[in-house]
Amino acid sequence: EDELQVIQPEKSVSVAAGESATLRCAMTSLIPVGPIMWFRGAGAGRELIYNQKEGHFPRVTTVSELTKRNNLDFSISISNITPADAGTYYCVKFRKGSPDDVEFKSGAGTELSVRAKPS
């Protein structure tokens, strides 16, 4: 049986300041059970970018509808990009745990670079 893979197809994405950036991520399986989250950076200091369950992420929208059944597309769009948003973004699958979920597998990352706003 093939184990779940986290696919981030783009190694890098370049976006002009003020535009929206789409960061693509797909899973190859619905199981193991557990949430998907997006982070900027890796390791202990990484920044949570999107978690559907908790938090307020006004600039982030999901590409697929939140009510889509058996969804495998976990791409997100970040609006009004600024140079401060530059960095490497990781789509991470967690395995359901009790009480805490456990990181299961991460995508390879997508590096977001921000171009100056065209004058």
């Epitope: 059970v33 999901t62 889509k68």
Partner: antibody
């Protein structure tokens, strides 16, 4: 058509064991989490256990006594029930999990159930 | 553990009338709530998921609403086959998945 057929229920003495099976067809079994839900006579629904791939989850009331497993080559879900108690008497339903996008699981198909009676 | 409380426990309704019953969660479950119908001697059947989305094949007379901690299932113009027990289930925070105690819809 999705079909779930439970078997293995019966009458067993307290402290005894039973193994329930659920034969699945009509969908890609290995791609979905599967769940056991039980219903005591005249009572409501109680979640028992869920299995993903290698990941398993149990209600506190059965933890350490029940073991959920699956054989994807046979499209079959199992529930090994040990140290059975009178309060385990119920109809046991096998259910297919479905998920909404980034959220948790609910149960879109159910078998007809198999009755387990624990009595001396 | 999130506790779901359904009310009323029993609802007596005449055929053709409207039935409305509620499911209250002990904490916020956002929209992660499903509704099931169980006819006597049968297995439960999924009616609604994500609080308001009808499962394929479920008649339009069934509708779900609410979010957070308060949810409602409404059946407009009850048919004879709608007399059954209805359960809500949350899938926001688990294990355990939890079900409400059920609402029995009986013929008045």
């Amino acid at each position: 058509d999705v079909q779930l057929v439970e078997s293995g229920g019966g009458v067993v003495q307290p402290g005894g064991s039973l193994r329930l099976s659920c034969a699945a067809s009509g969908f890609s079994f290995s791609n979905f989490a599967m769940t056991w839900v039980r219903q005591a006579p005249g009572e409501g629904l109680e979640w028992v256990s869920t299995i993903g791939s290698g990941d398993t989850y149990y209600a506190d009331s059965v933890k350490g006594r029940f073991t959920i497993s699956r054989d994807n080559s046979k499209n079959t879900l199992y529930l090994q029930m040990n140290s059975l108690r009178a309060e385990d008497t119920a109809v046991y339903y096998c259910a297919k999990d479905s998920t909404v996008s980034w959220s948790g699981d609910f149960f879109d198909y159910w078998g007809l159930g198999t009755l387990v009676t624990v009595s001396s | 553990e999130i506790v779901l409380t359904q009310s009323p426990a029993t609802l007596s309704v005449s055929p053709g009338e409207r039935a409305t019953f509620s499911c209250r969660a002990s904490q916020n479950v956002k929209n992660d709530l499903a509704w099931y119908q169980q006819r006597p001697g049968q297995a439960p059947r999924l009616l609604i998921y994500a609080a308001r989305i009808r499962e394929t094949g479920i008649p339009e007379r069934f509708s779900g609403s609410g979010s957070g901690t308060e949810f409602t299932l409404t059946i407009t113009s009850l048919q004879s086959e709608d007399f059954a027990v209805y359960y809500c289930q949350q899938y926001y925070d688990w294990p355990p998945f939890t079900f409400g105690g059920g609402t029995k819809v009986e013929i008045k």
